[in-house]
């Protein structure tokens, strides 16, 4: 069998809401994956499991089942959403994310995703992880082509 390639493209959108009393941030983060089937037969994308971490703490998880079938030598783009909650010991984030005087409230999140594919009764798992900037202060739609790879080692301007 030839390879099945999984490419994490990036964050497509992040929609934010707040609970003022609980000083809690809710971020619905939609990510985009490209899955390429380099085989001459169809493969099934059985499930996608994803989690989002902030500062080594898991703040959100998601699982999608029975997603799609990818034909021979075909590629499919799949969006998946991870609901995240930033609360409790991270409530200091609420202060930053709700600062009205600042326009961009970027925080660095680690996106982890595992894709399980199946063909002829055989399962295969492919995992990827990437650090991404996400704005926790406003609803944002990202241009994937422009912000495909964010190097978090570079200082923010």
């Amino acid at each position: 069998p030839r390879s099945i390639e999984v490419k994490y493209i990036g964050v497509k959108s992040a929609y934010v809401s707040y609970d003022a009393e609980k000083r809690t941030i809710y971020l619905n983060i939609t990510n985009t994956l490209n899955i390429t089937n380099n085989n001459y037969y169809s493969v099934e994308v059985e499930n996608i499991t994803a989690q989002v971490q902030f500062s080594k703490t898991v703040i959100g998880k998601a699982r999608l089942n029975n997603i799609t079938n990818i034909g021979p030598l075909d590629m499919k783009q799949i969006d998946y959403t991870v609901p995240t909650v930033i609360a409790e010991e991270m409530s200091y984030m609420y202060d930053f994310c709700t600062l009205l005087s600042i326009k961009v409230h970027n925080i660095v999140l680690m996106m982890q995703v595992t894709v399980t594919t199946a063909y002829f009764g055989h399962s295969e798992q492919i995992s990827q992880e990437r650090y991404q900037y996400v704005d926790c202060g406003r609803n944002t739609t990202y241009q994937l082509a422009q912000s495909e790879y964010l190097n978090v080692l570079q200082p923010q301007q």
Epitope: F96, T98, L99, I102, K103, Q157
Partner: antibody, heavy 120, light 112 residues
Framework: DVQLQQSGAELVRPGASVKLSCTAS????????MYWVKQRPEQGLEWIGR????????ENAPKFRGMATMTADTSSNTAYLQLNSLTSEDTAVYYC?????????????WGHGTSVTVSS | DVLMTQTPLSLPVSLGDQASISCRSS???????????LEWYLQKPGQAPKLLID???NRFSGVPDRFSGSGSGTDFTLKISRVEAEDLGVYYC?????????FGSGTKLEIK
């Protein structure tokens, strides 16, 4: 090093217009709001408004609508304040200001101010 | 517009004294997100204002702990526990909750 460099002092006639500039260094203005504040001689501070340089979206205090126009040029990293139909009441120092920060550190920056004198 | 009323207009103090400045807003300045964007600035002669406190009580970086902010809703106070010479100048409160944002009229802290 973050700096806001404002244009030099202006002496203008009543009824005339003037365009003040505020050039930023050390950061990209499209990622931050730019604010303008007025201070008349021996008086307090007045909030004129703010601009989002990325899309030109502005919010003005009603008092300054039609009289003060904020614009920005991201290619030169400069914010502008145009003051129209000037009167002696517009004799003041005009400050540009911004706030820059990340999760761990927020800083407030002000220009040195531009003095505008309206006199015939 | 939200009117910010500061008292007193002038505050003569001796060095080492405590100083207290009051700021009252004409309506609640609690934002819909639950935060109160009340700030305090100090302006010294010939200089641009400097931010001391934001969101009622958060001291800005580099601001000495003798400065403290308090209050809620419409009534706010800035206290300086022991006034030093470098604290003299004009203090302004500022609300950044409702557009247009507005400053108080200022309180001049001077030597008695």
């Amino acid at each position: 090093d973050v700096q806001l460099q404002q244009s030099g002092a202006e002496l203008v006639r009543p009824g005339a217009s003037v365009k003040l500039s505020c050039t930023a260094s050390g950061f990209n203005i499209k990622d931050y709001y730019m604010y303008w504040v007025k201070q008349r001689p021996e008086q307090g501070l007045e909030w004129i408004g703010r601009i989002d340089p990325e899309d030109g979206d502005t919010e003005n205090a009603p008092k300054f609508r039609g009289m003060a126009t904020m614009t920005a040029d991201t290619s030169s990293n400069t914010a502008y304040l145009q003051l129209n139909s000037l009167t002696s009441e517009d004799t003041a120092v005009y400050y540009c200001t911004t706030r820059i920060g990340n999760l761990y550190h927020v800083m407030d920056y002000w220009g040195h101010g531009t003095s505008v004198t309206v006199s015939s | 517009d939200v009117l910010m009323t500061q008292t007193p207009l002038s505050l003569p103090v001796s060095l080492g004294d405590q100083a207290s400045i009051s700021c009252r807003s004409s309506q609640s300045i609690v934002h819909s997100n639950g935060n109160t964007y009340l700030e305090w600035y100090l302006q010294k002669p010939g200089q641009a204002p400097k931010l001391l406190i934001d969101k009622v009580f958060n001291r800005f970086s580099g601001v000495p702990d003798r400065f403290s902010g308090s209050g809620s809703g419409t009534d706010f106070t800035l206290k300086i526990s022991r006034v030093e010479a470098e604290d003299l100048g004009v203090y302004y409160c500022f609300q950044g909750s409702h557009v247009p944002f507005t400053f108080g009229s200022g309180t001049k802290l001077e030597i008695k």
